[in-house]
């Protein structure tokens, strides 16, 4: 069913990183516009991105209300200039998205090494606790606030003068590692949610090396 000269949206895809969540679809509209609706499994439909010619819709504001809920979206197609027109079944053409559970599926964004500090033969490496768009009591929560101990970080580190990497793990945002005195080291971190089976890992952070601005060196 559907309206003459409109085509249903297809390839509905969730694109989500650190809970910033956008629904994308095809095709680019020709003489038609789209409206998106989103709901939880048990909730009411809420309309977003009314009569748009875009092929994406930012649904972050809706999904951050409860990131552990499972959401479904649908994209309605309307003829341009005649949005009241409906199909033979009495409603416009639409297509459903796959289900999406933000807590389980949002991609982990590339982490950033906030700082590192050497004290003798120990180095403390701190990972930036990135702010998300998830809110509680009118404040934005960090990635650690949202995921708690479900989120770990893996540190990769190596002597600047060699290629042999080592790793350490933490379920906080800090590492304390042993290093050889007088050697410079490079660091990269990766965020991981071990309990997931998909989207478990972020990409690696940019590499930071000792002897550059970000760190601090204290000889004890």
């Amino acid at each position: 069913s559907g309206t003459t000269n409109t085509v249903a949206a297809y390839n509905l895809t969730w694109k989500s990183t650190n809970f910033k969540t956008i629904l994308e679809w095809e095709p680019k509209p020709v003489n038609q516009v789209y409206t998106v609706q989103i709901s939880t499994k048990s909730g009411d439909w809420k309309s977003k991105c009314f009569y748009t010619t875009d092929t994406e819709c930012d649904l972050t504001d809706e999904i951050v209300k409860d990131v552990k809920q499972t959401y479904l979206a649908r994209v309605f197609s309307y003829p341009a200039g005649n949005v009241e027109s409906t199909g033979s079944a009495g409603e416009p053409l639409y297509e459903n998205s796959p289900e999406f559970t933000p807590y389980l599926e949002t991609n982990l964004g590339q982490p950033t090494i906030q700082s590192f500090e050497q004290v003798g033969t120990k180095v403390n490496v701190t990972v930036e606790d990135e702010r998300t768009l998830v809110r509680r009591n009118n404040t934005f929560l960090s990635l650690r606030d949202v995921f708690g101990k479900d989120l770990i970080y893996t540190l990769y580190y190596w002597k600047s003068s060699s290629s042999g990497k080592k790793t350490a793990k933490t379920n906080t945002n800090e590492f304390l590692i042993d290093v050889d005195k007088g050697e410079n080291y490079c660091f990269s971190v990766q965020a991981v949610i071990p309990s997931r089976t998909v989207n478990r890992k972020s990409t690696d952070s940019p590499v930071e090396c000792m002897g550059q601005e970000k760190g601090e060196f204290r000889e004890i």
Epitope: K166, T167, K169, I177, D178, V192, T197, R200
Partner: antibody, heavy 117, light 107 residues
Framework: EVLLQQSGPELVKPGASVKIPCKAS????????MDWVKQSHGKSLEWIGD????????IYNQKFKGKATLTVDKSSTTAYLELRSLTSEDTAVYFC??????????WGQGTTLTVSS | DIQMTQTPASQSASLGESVTITCLAS??????LAWYQQKPGKSPQLLIY???SLADGVPSRFSGSGSGTKFSFKISSLQAEDFVSYYC?????????FGGGTKLELK
């Protein structure tokens, strides 16, 4: 069902090389690192290293650097452990194991390598 | 490298008894510790992770405790199938080291 399938026993001569496969199935291969563990007869377990199948990045136990090389073939979801310049010290059972980050949750059945002339 | 010292290397016990195995890490590993069981000719099988968490499908007679550098593993009310080898492992810092193992023997 997660399965890590290793090849049968290998008998090789000193000085030779061997490449042991570990075929993974039942999960998304690129989501988990693959680790390799050595167990000499009647002895404990020794971690050789791990590989990230997504990008091929490897971490080695320094003890096995130059002895072991870890690779993957994403298209066949198979991890490989290559051991070179074999000596009798390399006679052992070699296990692949899926790395859950907090632990190794699934293990291959092990491949017995015997180095003998 | 972090050394994992596991004691005892072997222990004799009777059916229905309890046994405790200890693992000492040479430096703090928080709760990054796993315990595995290995039957003869088989691959290791996870029993405990994160020092105290029981893996899926593992009987409740197995338990783990500890944090930092000292960890314990307890089997209460030993069953016939428990008389095999046990290993601790730290997945905290590479190289991920194992304890020397404990072989449980039937008295």
């Amino acid at each position: 069902e997660v399965l890590l399938q290793q090849s049968g026993p290998e008998l090789v001569k000193p000085g030779a090389s061997v490449k042991i496969p570990c075929k993974a199935s039942g999960y998304t291969f690129t989501e988990y690192n693959m680790d390799w563990v050595k167990q000499s007869h009647g002895k404990s377990l020794e971690w050789i290293g791990d590989i990230n199948p997504n990008n091929g990045n490897t971490i080695y136990n320094q003890k096995f650097k130059g002895k072991a090389t870890l690779t993957v073939d994403k298209s066949s979801t198979t991890a490989y452990l290559e051991l070179r310049s074999l000596t009798s010290e390399d006679t052992a059972v070699y296990f692949c194991a899926r790395d859950h980050d907090y632990y190794f949750d699934f293990w291959g059945q092990g491949t017995t390598l015997t180095v003998s002339s | 490298d972090i050394q994992m010292t596991q004691t005892p290397a072997s222990q004799s016990a009777s059916l229905g008894e309890s046994v405790t195995i200890t693992c000492l890490a040479s430096q703090t590993i928080d709760t990054w510790l796993a315990w595995y069981q290995q039957k003869p000719g088989k691959s290791p099988q996870l029993l405990i992770y994160a020092a105290t968490s029981l893996a899926d499908g593992v009987p409740s007679r197995f338990s783990g405790s500890g944090s930092g550098t000292k960890f314990s593993f307890k089997i209460s009310s030993l069953q016939a199938e428990d008389f095999v080898s046990y290993y601790c492992q730290q997945p905290y810092s590479s190289p991920y080291t194992f304890g020397g193992g404990t072989k449980l023997e039937l008295k």
